[in-house]
């Protein structure tokens, strides 16, 4: 065999170069035929009207032809013929890669509720070969289930992802990423998850700052409720008792002036939205007022240069409990 060709892989719309090479040239006619066995070039003459075929090089040892704006219909075997006796023939296969025409992501629900399982579909249309679809939730790769539909040598791939959503997923992108030999770089589409969740309630003591509640002091608690949608109702109640008469409620704030022991108990902040309700409890314990501290005693001896100061602080015996948990979220 004296005639050589190489297979060609080209992306749709780009340029394919077909080369027929003769090792030992003897001025025999070289001819290039298309998959329908029509002559594209006979030496430097093109019988075919298709002007996408252009002669790049012609000599007794090579016939080199370019095919611009390649389409899927150009795919197939192209034959090089050398008119020796006997005639020689060799073929090159043009493979056309088609990137996906369209990448569409579709979420079953625009808004999901925490704990719910939602279906997300991603479709890569009309590619060749079939596209590989990968799923990511943020930076985490997830596993989907793909179905391939073939039509006229083209493939449409639909990948289905079943996703159980959590409140942390709110605002996180779900990314459908395509891998295909005709695609360089990252081809992806994404949708941001919108997850509704019941409120998370947290009680913050805004006064007193040091956190120790004593008789006669004031107490201010702020209820922070975060949810989606934002909680519509934030209420304060006293568990198993009436709210003290001197308690003042102002939106998410509870203010109790002039604390006394009768104020001891559990104060609950409740918040709700369309998803559900939640609460957080604060256990108030009012400590005795502080006892007065006597002036410090200083003993000085003339025999030494050392001064010893003894400071005695007398506090309520339960004061050590101030480090214990005072608020419980539910």
């Amino acid at each position: 065999q004296n005639l050589f060709t190489k297979d060609v892989t080209v992306i749709e719309g780009e340029v394919a170069t077909i080369s027929c090479q003769v090792n030992k040239s003897d001025d025999s006619v070289i001819q290039l035929l298309n998959p329908n066995r029509q002559t594209i070039y006979f030496r430097d003459f093109r019988p075919l009207k298709d002007s996408r075929f252009q002669l790049l090089n012609f000599s007794s040892s090579e016939l080199k032809v370019s095919l611009t704006n390649v389409s899927i219909s150009d795919e197939g075997r192209y034959f090089c013929q050398l008119y020796t006796d006997p005639p020689q023939e060799s073929y090159t296969t043009i493979t056309v890669l088609v990137p996906p025409r369209n990448l569409m992501i579709d979420i079953q629900k625009d808004t999901a509720v925490e704990g719910e399982e939602i279906e997300v579909n991603c479709t890569a249309m009309a590619s060749k070969p079939a596209t590989t679809i990968r799923w990511f939730k943020g930076n985490t790769e997830l596993k989907g289930k793909s179905e391939v539909e073939e039509w006229s040598d083209m493939y449409t791939v639909t990948s289905q992802l079943m996703l159980k959503v959590h409140k942390e997923d709110d605002g996180v992108p779900v990314i459908c990423q395509v891998e295909h030999p005709a695609v360089t770089g990252n081809l992806q589409t994404q949708r941001y998850l919108e997850v509704q969740y019941k409120p998370q309630v947290h009680i913050q003591m805004t006064y007193p700052l040091q956190g120790l509640t004593r008789e006669g002091d004031a107490l201010e608690l702020t209820c922070e409720a975060i949810g989606k949608p934002q909680p519509v109702m934030v209420t304060w109640v006293r568990v198993d008792d009436e709210m003290p008469q001197h308690a003042v409620l102002s939106g998410p704030n509870l203010f109790i002036n002039n604390l006394n022991k009768t104020d001891n108990g559990t104060y609950r902040c409740e918040a709700s939205n369309i998803v559900g309700k939640a609460h957080s409890d604060y256990m108030l314990y009012v400590y005795d007022p502080p006892t007065t501290i006597p002036p410090p005693t200083t003993t000085t001896t003339t025999t030494t240069t050392t001064t010893t100061t003894i400071l005695t602080i007398i506090t309520d015996s339960r004061a050590g409990e101030e480090g214990s948990i005072r608020a419980v979220d539910h």
């Epitope: 029509q38 002559t39 019988p47 009207k49 298709d50």
Partner: antibody, heavy 115, light 107 residues
Framework: EVQLLESGGGLVQPGGSLRLSCAAS????????MNWVRQAPGKGLEWVSG????????FYADSVKGRFTISRDNSKNTLYLQMNSLRAEDTAVYYC?????????????WGQGTL | QSALTQPPSVSVSPGQTARITCSGD??????VSWYQQKPGQSPVLVIF???KRPSGIPERFSGSNSGNTATLTVSGTRAMDEADYYC??????????FGTGTKVTVL
């Protein structure tokens, strides 16, 4: 004026040989591809063979491949067709035809033919 | 058996239009030429590359080619147009295939 004048036709036994000549004038012979076309009595036209302008390549119809040889002598402005192993079905008027010389391949001038 | 098929004959009145067809697989993808041959004479190129006229050929000769059919149209036919007409194309990988020929008679 372009002129093509064929000669060399005649009666020959099956298996015999003949050499046809075509004398060209009125154009730059060495710049054009040349061809032989034949027409059997009462039949249509059939292309037989073609040759490059400098004689560097030749091409034949399957029906004559291996039996006929086309050649040219640009110094004499003459085209030849050597016909060997002749068969009854080779009986025809043989025309030499000049190429139009465009990007295509068309026969714009023909000789009067030789039988 | 030619791969290019023409009607054996076409009759036309003087001054009328004669249409000669030439059929072949995917013919529209390649260039077609037309030759006129009067009795006892050599062929004459009248149309090349589907629709181009060589110098000296009257404007009444025109050509078209698409799909599987090429057509030679002779408008305002004259008695001098009476002849055999052959289409010619590169068919597949076979060069210079001539059609079966059409005899045009001017009535």
């Amino acid at each position: 004026e372009v002129q093509l004048l064929e000669s060399g036709g005649g009666l020959v036994q099956p298996g015999g040989s003949l050499r046809l000549s075509c004398a060209a004038s009125g154009f730059t012979f060495s710049s054009y591809k040349m061809n032989w076309v034949r027409q059997a009595p009462g039949k249509g036209l059939e292309w037989v063979s073609g040759i490059g302008s400098s004689g560097d390549w030749t091409f034949y119809a399957d029906s004559v491949k291996g039996r006929f040889t086309i050649s040219r002598d640009n110094s004499k402005n003459t085209l030849y067709l050597q016909m060997n192993s002749l068969r009854a079905e080779d009986t025809a008027v043989y025309y030499c035809a000049k190429d139009l010389g465009t990007s295509g391949w068309n026969f714009d001038y023909w000789g009067q033919g030789t039988l | 058996q030619s791969a290019l098929t023409q009607p054996p004959s076409v009759s036309v009145s003087p001054g009328q239009t004669a249409r000669i067809t030439c059929s072949g697989d995917r013919l529209g993808e390649t260039y077609v030429s037309w030759y006129q041959q009067k009795p006892g004479q050599s062929p004459v190129l009248v149309i090349f590359e589907d629709n181009k006229r060589p110098s000296g050929i009257p404007e009444r000769f025109s050509g078209s080619n698409s799909g599987n059919t090429a057509t030679l149209t002779v408008s305002g036919t004259r008695a001098m147009d009476e002849a055999d007409y052959y289409c010619q194309a590169w068919v597949g990988s076979t060069p210079f295939v001539f059609g079966t020929g059409t005899k045009v008679t001017v009535l």
